[in-house]
């Protein structure tokens, strides 16, 4: 005897109480695949979780985290506080940027300071964990009476400040 349940599409369940008739999922429940004997309860996004996508008869609700937090896990099962500027998110959580790198945002990764010398410029303002270096004119441009024929002096390492 063929199992009539296999004909029940997503958004329905196979109702054994009614001779295996396909019944629509009740409110606040869903079935994302066909042939299911029960519908799953919709996820509720509450507390630190906010709704990104409402539940439908064929798909679960999707949650996001409230402002200042970001999701962990494929289905946003946990919320983690955004990192501070000068940090990056690692597998173990927020970690300070290593020397020579910076992050001016609360998300993303630490990026290397700009190497001013590659553009023939010098460091005007040293870099920090939160800010990139600021490059200024080349050292040659700064020396009085320097001609444009003068080769640029080697710039010191970007971001290094005297200890």
């Amino acid at each position: 005897l063929q199992d009539l349940c296999s004909n029940c599409p997503a958004g329905t369940f196979c109702d054994n109480n009614r001779s295996q008739i396909c019944s629509p999922c009740p409110p606040n429940s869903f079935s994302s695949a066909g042939g299911q004997r029960t519908c799953d309860i919709c996820r509720q996004c509450k507390g630190v979780f906010k709704t990104r996508k409402e539940c439908s008869s064929t798909s679960n609700a999707e949650c996001d985290c409230i402002s200042g937090y970001h999701c962990l896990g494929a289905e946003c099962s946990m919320c983690e506080q955004d990192c501070k500027q000068g940090q990056e998110l690692t597998k173990k959580g927020c970690k300070d940027c290593c020397f020579g790198t910076f992050n001016d945002q609360k998300r993303g990764i630490c990026r290397p300071w700009t190497n001013c010398s590659l553009d023939g410029k010098s460091v005007l303002v040293n870099g920090t964990k939160e800010r990139d270096v600021v490059c200024g004119p080349s050292p040659a441009d700064l020396s009085p009476g320097a001609s444009s024929a003068t080769p640029p002096a080697p710039a010191r390492e970007p971001g290094h400040s005297p200890q």
């Epitope: 509720q44 507390g47 919320c79």
Partner: antibody
Framework: QVQLVQSGAEVKKPGASVKVSCKAS????????MHWVRQAPGQGLEWMGA????????DYNQKFKDRVTMTRDTSISTAYMELSRLRSDDTAVYYC?????????WGQGTLVTVSS | DIQMTQSPSSLSASVGDRVTITCRAS??????LNWYQQKPGGAVKLLIY???RLHSGVPSRFSGSGSGTDYTLTISSLQPEDFATYFC?????????FGGGTKVEIR
């Protein structure tokens, strides 16, 4: 800083009710679910349920469903857990905890002793 | 309900020892596993969440790993302040459930 401060210890007779409070400070109270966990003497931790302060919606552990009531007063950033028809095996420390999918901040605990 | 089985229930160790505590779930909890520390006074603190993420202020000697049903808390070099009871807890499904706890005592 984020803090949860609970009400003081209680001694109750069997059959009575107890209401424990948990006052939140240092964050937006309505933005995070508050959970309640208890620990009987020498035992492990047992989840009792949770309340969404924004809506007042609750989720209870089936074990306590007919005896527990969780409420909140958003005007004073306080959550409450009331347990009725107390028995001697309800003697425990009751904790509130803020939820992010994990309990990042816990109250100091409230000892409830049920004794005749 | 998801059952959480923690082992050992107690252990004796010395300062400087490497300590490993395991937690097994009765079904796949997809890394939704947290670890807590409880000192004798009763205060409970979050150590690790989402299997391996260190809560702010927790020393780096604590680490977590695992997937599926099997998870581990490791203390790389036990310090005097680490003598306490440790609990795992799953956040995969309601009701949230905890392991039975592991008491770490001084040898």
């Amino acid at each position: 800083q984020v803090q949860l401060v609970q009400s003081g210890a209680e001694v109750k007779k069997p059959g009575a009710s107890v209401k424990v409070s948990c006052k939140a400070s240092g964050y937006t109270f309505a933005g995070f679910e508050m959970h309640w966990v208890r620990q009987a003497p020498g035992q492990g931790l047992e989840w009792m349920g949770a309340i969404d302060p924004k809506t007042g919606g609750t989720d209870y552990n089936q074990k306590f469903k007919d005896r527990v009531t969780m409420t909140r007063d958003t005007s004073i950033s306080t959550a409450y857990m009331e347990l009725s028809r107390l028995r001697s095996d309800d003697t425990a420390v009751y904790y509130c905890a803020r939820d992010l999918g994990y309990f990042d901040v816990w109250g100091q605990g409230t000892l409830v002793t049920v004794s005749s | 309900d998801i059952q959480m089985t923690q082992s050992p229930s107690s252990l004796s160790a010395s300062v400087g020892d490497r300590v490993t505590i395991t937690c097994r779930a009765s079904q796949d909890i997809r890394s939704n596993l947290n670890w807590y520390q409880q000192k004798p006074g009763g205060a409970v603190k979050l150590l690790i969440y989402y299997t391996s993420r260190l809560h702010s202020g927790v020393p780096s000697r604590f680490s977590g790993s695992g997937s599926g049903t099997d998870y581990t808390l490791t203390i790389s070099s036990l310090q005097p302040e680490d003598f306490a009871t440790y609990f795992c807890q799953q956040s995969e499904k309601l009701p949230r459930t905890f392991g039975g706890g592991t008491k770490v005592e001084i040898r």
